[in-house]
């Protein structure tokens, strides 16, 4: 059997670190057998059988010029084997970042903090942290460790499914190469890393007859559980075209009627989501959607409740049917869309200028 331990990595390759002494091992001889060493394709003897180093070649302070293929020969001239030297560094602790787009699963990505230059793999696992007392920590089979399954497509990512929202987890990512291993431990709580995906299906529509209004509607992100135990809250921003500052509102549900749009101008609208109890952080903004307030007169019929108040309402309708102003007005439209439920009383508007 070969006297050379097989390092993790491709066969026939041995490894060392730049600036350090490197020992190469002749694979096809018995341990201690004296051999001669040559660079592949070069007749010059690097180290003879009388070196006293047996089956090993020692390179002091290896550098990049020492990388390449070496040949060892036994005393009778037979080939003892070929060895390729590759230089690089032992692993440094990888950098690990975890994120959750919902409250049941989370994923962790990693990156080397230094490129070793050697074949590298990663071992990923996690365990649930169970704390008994203030300073004591109990480990039991129910707390792991369990493997964190890695992305089958080879991305530097693993996913923990079925995580518990209120639990703490310790992620272990170990970088392994032929010169060693290095581990990063990262403590994670789903509550702190929760960041929903942005809301989907954002639509912005005019409200016929209301030149200062736009109705925006959207849906939960597809990644959020369909029967959620935890709801999302939303933040909506809007601005007229060519206007640099966004106005911000926090809608109560999945739609919002903007009551202070600039008549005649297209408006950009975007929405963001967050856990309704403020766990984690706000999502990124959705792609912007655009809409322009209506310019025509009110087309809707008078609501049912108005019967018996016809004379009083005729004046109101006549006023609302008057043509939209010729130039945009920056004053809010004071008229409620639904006379029974004035929108202006429901929401706080924050204007960022």
């Amino acid at each position: 059997s070969s006297p050379c331990p097989q390092a993790w990595g491709p066969p026939g390759v041995q490894y060392g670190q730049p600036g350090r002494s490197v020992k190469l091992c002749c694979p096809g001889v018995t341990a201690g057998d004296p051999v001669s060493w040559f660079r592949d394709g070069e007749p010059k003897l690097l180290q003879g059988p009388d070196s006293g180093l047996g089956h090993e070649l020692v390179l002091a302070q290896a550098d990049s010029t020492d990388e390449g293929t070496y040949i060892c020969q036994t005393l009778d001239g037979a080939l003892g084997g070929t060895v390729t030297l590759q230089l690089g560094y032992p692993p440094a602790r990888p950098v690990v970042s975890c994120q959750a787009a919902d409250y049941e699963n989370f994923s962790c990505t990693w990156s080397p903090s230094q490129i070793s230059g050697l074949p590298t793999r990663y071992l990923t696992s996690y365990r649930k942290k169970t704390v008994l007392g203030a300073d004591s920590q109990r480990r039991s089979p129910s707390t792991g460790p369990w493997p964190c399954p890695q992305d089958p497509l080879g991305a530097a990512r693993c996913v923990v499914h079925g995580a518990e929202f209120w639990s703490q987890y310790r992620i272990n990512v170990t970088e392994v190469n032929p010169l060693g291993a290095s581990t990063r431990l990262l403590d994670v709580s789903l509550q702190s890393i929760l960041r929903p995906d942005p809301p989907q299906g954002l639509r912005v529509e005019s409200v016929p007859g209301y030149p200062r209004r736009l109705r925006a509607s959207w849906t939960y992100p597809a990644s959020w559980p369909s029967q959620p135990h935890f709801l999302l809250k939303f933040r909506l921003q809007y601005r007229p075209a060519q206007h640099p500052a966004w106005s911000t509102v926090e809608p109560a549900g999945l739609e919002e009627v903007i009551t202070d749009a600039v008549a005649g101008l297209p408006h950009a609208v975007r929405v963001s989501a967050r856990d309704f109890l403020d766990a984690g952080t706000w999502s990124t903004w959705s792609p912007e959607a655009w809409g322009t307030p209506s310019t025509g007169p009110l087309q809707d019929e008078i609501p049912d409740w108005s019967q018996g108040h016809g004379q009083q309402l005729e004046a109101v309708v006549a006023q609302e049917d008057s043509p939209a102003p010729a130039r945009p007005s920056l004053q809010p439209d004071p008229r409620p869309l639904d006379h029974r439920d004035p929108l202006e009383q429901h929401h706080h508007h924050h204007h960022h200028h």
Epitope: A92, V95, T109, S113, Q114, A156
Partner: antibody, heavy 118, light 107 residues
Framework: EVQLLESGGGLVQPGGSLRLSCAAS????????MGWVRQAPGKGLEWVSS????????IYADSVKGRFTISRDNSKNTLYLQMNSLRAEDTAVYYC???????????WGQGTLVTVSS | DIQMTQSPSSLSASVGDRVTITCQAS??????LNWYLHKPGKAPKLLIY???NLQTGVPSRFSGSGSGTDFTFTITSLQPEDFGTYYC?????????FGPGTTVDIK
Amino acid sequence: EVQLLESGGGLVQPGGSLRLSCAASGFTFSRYMMGWVRQAPGKGLEWVSSIVPSGGITIYADSVKGRFTISRDNSKNTLYLQMNSLRAEDTAVYYCARDHMGIVATDWGQGTLVTVSS
Amino acid sequence: DIQMTQSPSSLSASVGDRVTITCQASQDITNYLNWYLHKPGKAPKLLIYDASNLQTGVPSRFSGSGSGTDFTFTITSLQPEDFGTYYCQQYDTLHPSFGPGTTVDIK
């Protein structure tokens, strides 16, 4: 010999923006994690931000998160710090630093002064 | 985030004196600790890494010890070029943090 040279500092008004650069030489820039550390006048050192060799993961101090963006161009051997919404308390000498073998900030530049004042 | 404390905040010493600075972390940081010397107008210089390893080219009068939460930095015989501010720094987490510094000046 590792060399890090910062530039881009100067006087900026509160709310303004500035982009710092760090030109690296003497080592294979694309293999190393890099970062920024600052020192406010009369204060101690404060870590600001770090970026992995590929640029794929960035990390920020809470005091700058959402306002500062670290990035790198490995083809130009250059590290950047984009600073937006600057505040008076961001006034400091900003140092570029290299990590080595998992050890943070083994090598430093000479620093560039950023002054935020009206 | 991990808080680092250092003591003393300043000290006056003479050339040849033995100087000791302590650093404490708010939680266990294993041995992920650096010691730096910073002089005005200069770049900070790494002296000790991994709590006790001497950085290449740093004189052997500097040493460090400790693990967990308590660390010590020692200069066995203070030299004129050693005056300045010394900082400890933890890098156990992805958010490194520095101690407040210890200023060493001439008595």
